[in-house]
Structures are given as structure tokens and as C-alpha cells.
Amino acid sequence: EAHKSEIAHRYNDLGEQHFKGLVLIAFSQYLQKCSYDEHAKLVQEVTDFAKTCVADESAANCDKSLHTLFGDKLCAIPNLRENYGELADCCTKQEPERNECFLQHKDDNPSLPPFERPEAEAMCTSFKENPTTFMGHYLHEVARRHPYFYAPELLYYAEQYNEILTQCCAEADKESCLTPKLDGVKEKALVSSVRQRMKCSSMQKFGERAFKAWAVARLSQTFPNADFAEITKLATDLTKVNKECCHGDLLECADDRAELAKYMCENQATISSKLQTCCDKPLLKKAHCLSEVEHDTMPADLPAIAADFVEDQEVCKNYAEAKDVFLGTFLYEYSRRHPDYSVSLLLRLAKKYEATLEKCCAEANPPACYGTVLAEFQPLVEEPKNLVKTNCDLYEKLGEYGFQNAILVRYTQKAPQVSTPTLVEAARNLGRVGTKCCTLPEDQRLPCVEDYLSAILNRVCLLHEKTPVSEHVTKCCSGSLVERRPCFSALTVDETYVPKEFKAETFTFHSDICTLPEKEKQIKKQTALAELVKHKPKATAEQLKTVMDDFAQFLDTCCKAADKDTCFSTEGPNLVTRCKDALA
């Protein structure tokens, strides 16, 4: 229904705390360089204004759209051009063009320092002093670094953060209580970020239809007992929610997500038998829980897929009558039978089925043509299954760090023109798939591996778009989202690449490396590994292993030495010479 004042409506629906959190996230995602204090001031002004509209919906400006109100606030910021350059030009536009302009200027890789966690004692002190400000800082810091983070989900992670601090700050050993718990939240939040970015990419590049197909497949796997009409309704609602969040309409997004959670909990009987535990939780936990609820048990009496989609004489007639509905039904029926497949694979199969019907239904004898379509799915299914087996075997043999290194070598050979920091970040993220997925039961591995890899490769594509340097990467990133992972997997050594000159300074290290945390040490070593491959793209695995073992031994020796600086300055050049010889 239409409301006289949109801002009053959202404030009433969401409540002050969530309203303020979402406005802070929205501003932080749009203007990523502003300080917390600048944004907190704007949020307070917007909240005060919302309250006046709640008191009187007819008050001045209360009838304005949220984009107009928020955009006017952002455009009133002093020194906008000095701090944000051409983003300031957005302010010369009218809505809805102004909001579109803001969206286009979101930076997926802002030049901000890594979000450093303060030490436990300091964290607990500032949390106890002012929990609201502390959580505000968290929302601001995460949102500005992840401008497409799913806003209602970020509120959930902030709530988790809050609960962990409340619990651990009361403990004697705050550090050992906080560290593992906050690491866990951080890991989950980073995965959530890349997954949501993938959804927004799908929406931005291929439109709502592409996202809705993703949602139909995913929901059908999770709720195999729900009928097609129910799945379509959920997919339509979920598409609206994600469209709003990806479009910066965070208040509407959070409000609609809460509505969707409410609907699901009120209609458990027609959706799934697994929802009750989620539905007993408070709002943020409930929506989060529903988003990752376990798959319902598949109906025992499902007929073979061939009956309606291959053997039926009416296939082409049904396809002609309503292409999207017929293909949607195919995707639903196939997905509910295959919780063991990735969504990407299911979408590839649906695409293959569509292409087959397009070709065969135009022939004089369609049934003879599409009769073999299910057999033609086989290679499409085998390819990711082999990928999972090969990579999980390698992960089990090498462990996470070694697996990351193997991926780093592979990807540096595929796209040596890509910057080393991007390659290292990508390989580290891709390598985490082992820890995340390879330990799961067999039937959960494929969906976990492939859908996670797809999300990480989406980030690779986004970073590469900013500064395109590799034709290989451009080729894989230009195609459809579901074809990206197979495209990257199929890439081989880039034969067009002219190897980098050997620069001794790239492989020169100093004693400061010894005091770095383990993660930072790994990144330094992985940076050197990528540079080695760029110097010798055709180096064998054996040669690279020799060099890296030598390098690890050098670090170990010098970091244990009494005079570290002398060790690094005398042994370092020897290491460089040995490396050159080993790779000659």
C-alpha cells in the first residue's frame, strides 16, 4: 500500500535501532572515505527527521522518496569533490539517475587500511564505555570496505559481535575467549560478503530473470516438498529483497526480508518441515537461520525427470506456450532431485536443456532430436565432480597453505599479467575452499566447492574490470556467471606472456618479516612465489618446490639467528643466486 511518508513507514516498521544501523550502512557503502563521526552525524539528522515525520506525516519534505532524502544528505557533505572527485558530479543529477550514479561509483577495492582488531583489553573498555558507538564503528568499517554487503545480514553479524563481547569481556582471559569467536564471525562475514557480491553482479549484469533462476534452483534444493507455485512465490520475493539491497534501498530490503521470514514461518506446512527451530528465534537470527536452513527430506515418490521433459509428446507445445514457466518447472524439478549439485551446475543444465529445445523444437521431428538430452548432461555433470575430487585430494595431501600455493602457481600461469596482490588474495581465498568444503560429506562437497569458487572468481572479475590486463581473464569474465568457473578451470599457461625480468629486490627480505603474524608471513612468501612464476611461467612444480623450501629454510635460519639483520643481508643474496640457478 502507498504511504504518505516513506521514511516514517520504514522507521515504524524497523524500529529506531535497526533504522539507524541501516542508514549508517547505506551512507558508509556510498561514501566509503568518510569518517565514522561524519556519517554518525548524518545518521542522527536523518533519524531526527524520520521522527518528525512519524509524529506528522504531512510535515515538510516527509513525502519525499528515500533516495531523494538520502541523496540530498550525501550531496550536502562539505568538500565532496576534494574527497571523492567525479562522484560529486552525481549531485548534479536528478533522481533516479543520481542514485544510479552513486551505485556506479561504489568501489569494490577501496584503498583503506585493513580493518585491524584492537587488543582485547582496549576493545572491552571501549565496548563497555559505549556499546552503541562501538557497534556503529563496526558497521561503518565493514560497510565501507564491502559496499555490497547484505545490510540486514550485517546487522546480524553486529549482533553476534555484541553477544561475543558481552560474554568475553566478563571473562578473566578476554583474549582467548574473544579471538577464536571473533575470527569465526569474521570468516563467516567475509564469505557472506563475496556471496552477496555475486548476487548483485548477477542482478546488475544479467537482470532479475538470472537472479530468479538462481533462487528457484537454490530454493528447490532446500525445499523439495514445496510445490512449484510456492517456490516461484519465494523466489520472486527473494529477488525483490536482493534487488533492493543491491540497489542501495536498504530500509526496504530489510523490511521486505523480515516480511519474507514472517511468511515462511507462517507457511511452514507448505514449505518445509525444517523451519521450526529458525522460526523460534528473534528477527535477525531467524532470517539468517532461514537463509542457511538444512535441506528438507526429498519426497520418496518423485517420478523420473524424463517423463515430463523428454518422453512427453507435448514438450515443444508446452515450451511454446510459456517458455519461462516450462524452463522454470524443469529447473525446479531437476533441482529438487539434486541437492548434491551446485546451483551453478543446475543452471548450466537448464541452459543446455533450453538450447536443446530451441534447436530441436524447430526441427520436423523434435522428439527424435531432444530424446538424448539427459545423456548429453553427463559431461556437464562429470566436469565439476572431477574438479572436486582432484582438488580435495590435493588439499588433503598439501594442507591449506600448500593447497593455496598450488592454486597460486596455477592461476599465475593462467593470468600472469594480473597484479601479484590480486593473485595472492584470489589464491588464498580459492585455497580456503579445501578447509571449508573438502571435509564435508560427499553429497555436500560439490555444491559447497563450486558455488564458493564461483563467488571468489566473481571478485577476481570485478577487480580485473577496473584495470583489465589479461585477455584470458577478460574472456572468462565476459561470459555468463555460471560458465565462469569452468572457463577459469580450463585456462592453461598463457603463451602470449613475456616473462618478467628477474629483479633481486623482489626477493630481498629483511628481519622485520620475523615478527609478522603467521598470516602476513604467508602472504610475503606467496608474493615471492607469484613473482617467481611471473619470472619463469614454465617452471616445473619440482623447481618451484625446491626454491620455496630453500626460501622457508632461509627464513627459519635467519629468524633464529642472534644477529638477524646480518643473517638477512649476507644469506639473502646467496638465496637469490641459488633461486636463479634452480630456475635456469
Epitope: E314, V315, C316, K317, A320, C361, A362, E363, A364, P367
Partner: nanobody
Framework: KVQLVESGGGLVQPGGSLRLSCAAS????????MSWVRQAPGKGLEWVSS????????LYADSVEGRFTISRDNSKNTLYLQMNSLRAEDTAVYYC????????SSQGTLVTVSS
């Protein structure tokens, strides 16, 4: 909504000719192969002929081969069946269908071959 409307049927003497038409709407006509099927009084549906979307490929039942010709005009979204040398056993209701369908979903047009 997919619609198929057949016309051109009637009473004809053995050895005579008729041209059936099927006007199609509600779908991308040129993307779909089309067929003619028929149902004689008291009998089941029988496939008669099929044509590809482009019109380049045609198929005929042995019983009509050499006497019937299927064709289409994609600019007019229309399917045709030219029937020559008609026989008493060609008496039936003729339906046009999409793809390989053997179910009639339209009214059909009655062809009666009788002296």
C-alpha cells in the same frame, strides 16, 4: 496464449484436392516445427506430416507420401497442407500441432472424401 485455428476442410470427391490452413498465434511460429495429425471417425489420432521451423525439412506418413505436401509461410504465421488424389480413407478431422505433439488442442477442420 497459444492459438491454432484450422480451416479449408470440406466435402470432396475421391481424386479431388483440398488445401488446409492453420493460423498460429501466441508463440514464435518460425522457431517451432509443426505437424498435421488427423482423427478418422471412431479411430485414434494419426500423425500425417511434419515440417521444420524454417520449412527446409519435411516428413510424411507412408499413407500420404507423394499425395500430400506440407508447407508454411512464416511471415504470415500460417501452416498449410496441400492434399491431392484424396481417398475415402483420408476422411477425418485434421488438426495442426506444435512440435511432435500427438494431442489436438484446437477445433480442427473436417475433411470428408465421398462420392
Amino acid at each position: 496464449k497459444v492459438q491454432l485455428v484450422e480451416s479449408g476442410g470440406g466435402l470432396v470427391q475421391p481424386g479431388g484436392s483440398l488445401r488446409l490452413s492453420c493460423a498460429a498465434s501466441g508463440f514464435t511460429f518460425s522457431s517451432f516445427g509443426m505437424s498435421w495429425v488427423r482423427q478418422a471417425p471412431g479411430k485414434g489420432l494419426e500423425w500425417v506430416s511434419s515440417i521444420s521451423g524454417s520449412g527446409s525439412d519435411t516428413l510424411y506418413a507412408d499413407s500420404v507420401e507423394g499425395r500430400f505436401t506440407i508447407s508454411r509461410d512464416n511471415s504470415k504465421n500460417t501452416l498449410y497442407l496441400q492434399m491431392n488424389s484424396l481417398r475415402a480413407e483420408d476422411t477425418a478431422v485434421y488438426y495442426c500441432t506444435i512440435g511432435g505433439s500427438l494431442k489436438q488442442s484446437s477445433q480442427g477442420t473436417l475433411v470428408t472424401v465421398s462420392s
